[in-house]
């Protein structure tokens, strides 16, 4: 019976300790209950031990026990020894439980402090979160306003761009018109001396002179009067330009040629001549133009196939194979005559295209333009 009770006490203790440790209910109440239960069990145990001791005394007194053998007495002594051992063990456990109780109290205090700190932190975090949410919503509002402003500005920019483009075009047209007028005036003045008179009367037929010694090939001379119209020959490849030779002795007058074909009647010569320099053949090279008596290059800004097309066709080629930028055929020397040239592709020569500016400083010879014409 005692053993059973003892077990139930232990189980109750275990439950109470578990409850204490898991922190069920109010902490201080639990401690009090724990102590009460513990003390109650201790006093019960003491009472039972006392009861056993009393019984032992009574048994010793009775005659019935005097007849008991020594072995029974020995056993009883053993039991007493065990009980005293158990008691001291229980006392030890009591001390341990006291220690645990103290630890639990201090742990409880620590947990309370921690809970308090967490609650404070929680409050602060909630406060901060609220503030941040407010700030974020304000920021979102600002971003929305800014993006709306940006959109409005973008629209305004597009309109402005279109207006500016229009104005720039108008300004370019004015500039071109002024240049054109200036050029027309200068041509008019220049051409006062260039007006072609009527052909003179035919001269008498002279004797054919011996052929003069031919010097090394020189630069092409001015175009002579047309001779007899021959059959059209196949186009030969132009030879490379030779060094100018010394002039040969003039021969006697040759026989009189047939009457030349009627000229176009145009007293103006084109103000630009074009040549291709530095290519693998006469059909390609850096584009150079003769302007104001000086050969110069064209900058590759806006240099595209339609401009190359005009250059090639003006040189007698059927079309353009490729246009080249960035001094593909080497850097030229002298002025960079043109910067931006705009052609639709069907103009008969580069001077017919839209030329923004003659004599540009916005480019360097590393940007010299070139073409490869189709053969």
């Amino acid at each position: 019976k005692w053993e059973t009770k003892n077990c139930s006490v232990s189980s109750t203790n275990a439950n109470d300790i578990t409850q204490s440790l898991t922190g069920k209910g109010n902490d201080s109440e639990e401690e009090m209950r724990f102590q009460e239960v513990f003390m109650e069990h201790m006093s019960n145990m003491e009472k039972r031990i006392q009861h056993i001791l009393d019984m032992e005394a009574n048994l010793m007194d009775t005659e019935h026990f005097q007849n008991f053998s020594m072995t029974t007495d020995q056993r009883f002594n053993d039991i007493l020894l065990q009980l005293s051992t158990l008691f001291s063990s229980v006392q030890g456990h009591g001390n341990a439980i006291d220690e645990i109780s103290k630890s639990l109290i201090s742990l409880n205090t620590t947990l309370l402090d921690l809970q308090l700190n967490i609650e404070n932190l929680n409050g602060k975090i909630q406060e901060n979160t609220f503030k941040q949410q407010e700030e974020i919503s304000k920021l979102e509002e600002r971003v929305y306003n800014v993006s709306a402003e940006i959109m409005a500005m973008k629209e305004e920019q597009v309109h402005l761009e279109q207006e500016i483009k229009g104005e720039v075009k108008v300004l370019n047209n004015i500039t071109n018109d002024l240049r054109l007028k200036d050029w027309e005036h200068s041509q008019t003045l220049r051409n006062i001396t260039l007006i072609q008179g009527p052909p003179g009367p035919p001269g008498e037929k002279g004797d054919r002179g011996p052929t003069g010694e031919s010097g090394p090939r020189g630069f092409p001379g001015p175009i002579g009067p047309p001779g007899l119209k021959g059959d059209r020959g196949a186009i030969g490849f132009p030879g490379s330009r030779g060094l100018p030779g010394y002039a040969g002795r003039p021969g006697n007058s040759g026989p009189k040629g047939q009457k030349g074909e009627k000229g176009s009647g145009n007293t103006l010569t084109p103000f630009t001549k074009v040549r291709l320099v530095g290519g693998s053949g006469p059909h390609e090279g850096r584009v150079e133009i003769l302007h104001s008596g000086q050969w110069g290059t064209i900058c590759d800004d806006r240099w595209e196939v339609r401009v190359g097309q005009v250059v090639c066709r003006s040189l007698g080629y059927p079309g353009v194979q490729a246009v080249h930028k960035a001094a593909h055929f080497g850097q030229g020397t002298g002025p960079i005559w043109l910067n931006e040239v705009f052609c639709f592709g069907r103009e008969s020569s580069i001077e017919e295209c839209k030329i923004r500016q003659w004599g540009t400083r916005a480019c360097s010879h590393s940007e010299d333009a070139g073409v490869t014409c189709t053969l």
Partner: antibody
């Protein structure tokens, strides 16, 4: 010598789209530019759009922006003009023309024969 | 956009007459003006470019003049093949290129 040959007449219902072609010969399409001009019955000439060398891109008249698309097919040297959301107001003869600079101004010296588009329900 | 206004809208004349058609721009267009002739069922044909330059292949009886805002096309002696509609066109401020509304030249 340039020649521009346009596709044949077409009839469309309101709201539909039409795509006209303009075949180039004498030059390749990369060597010239194509512009489009239309003429409503008994009315004047109205420029629609085309390649602008100064802009370096195809430009459109404000009236047609978003409704007209100009494209090119290099291999058959053919230019196309597509007009969408047709209304009876779009009934007209549509011309393709090739421009050049004439003393810095733009002039059209070669024109296609024109394509009549009739928009009717 | 620049507006181009032609006058008169229509005109009756006889073969041999001297005829003048005018074109006015809503703002100065310098000399960036071209003239075209169009016959019924045909595409327009370039006659004069840059206000006064005669397009190759066009008879010399056609001439153009003017600059700024006022321009004229003159046919010195009307021929039967000249009866057609005439349009002026500016390319000073582009896009867009704009045309006049046309002048119809009829036989009197």
């Amino acid at each position: 010598q340039v020649q521009l040959v346009q596709s044949g007449a077409e009839v469309r219902e309101p709201g539909a789209s039409v795509k006209l072609s303009c075949k180039v010969s004498g030059y390749t399409l990369t060597e010239l530019s194509i512009h489009w001009v239309r003429q409503a019955p008994g009315k004047g000439l109205e420029w629609m759009g085309g390649f602008d060398p100064e802009e370096g891109e195809t430009v459109y008249a404000q009236k047609f922006r978003g409704r007209v698309t100009l494209t090119e097919d290099i291999s058959p040297d053919t230019a196309y003009m597509e007009l969408s959301s047709l209304t009876s107001e779009d009934t007209a003869v549509y011309y393709c023309a090739t421009p050049r600079y004439c003393n810095n101004g733009i002039c059209y010296d070669y024109w296609g024969q024109g394509t009549l588009i009739t928009v009717s329900s | 956009d620049i507006q181009m206004t032609q006058s008169p809208s229509s005109l009756s004349a006889s073969v041999g007459d001297r005829v003048t058609i005018t074109c006015r721009a809503s703002q100065s267009i310098s000399s960036y003006l071209n003239w075209y002739q169009q016959k019924p069922g045909k595409a327009p044909k370039l006659l004069i470019y840059a206000a006064s330059s005669l397009q190759s292949g066009v008879p010399s009886r056609f001439s153009g003049s003017g600059s700024g805002t006022d321009f004229t096309l003159t046919i010195s002696s009307l021929q039967p093949e000249d009866f057609a509609t005439y349009y002026c066109q500016q390319s000073y401020s582009t896009p867009p290129i704009t045309f006049g509304q046309g002048t119809r030249l009829e036989i009197k």
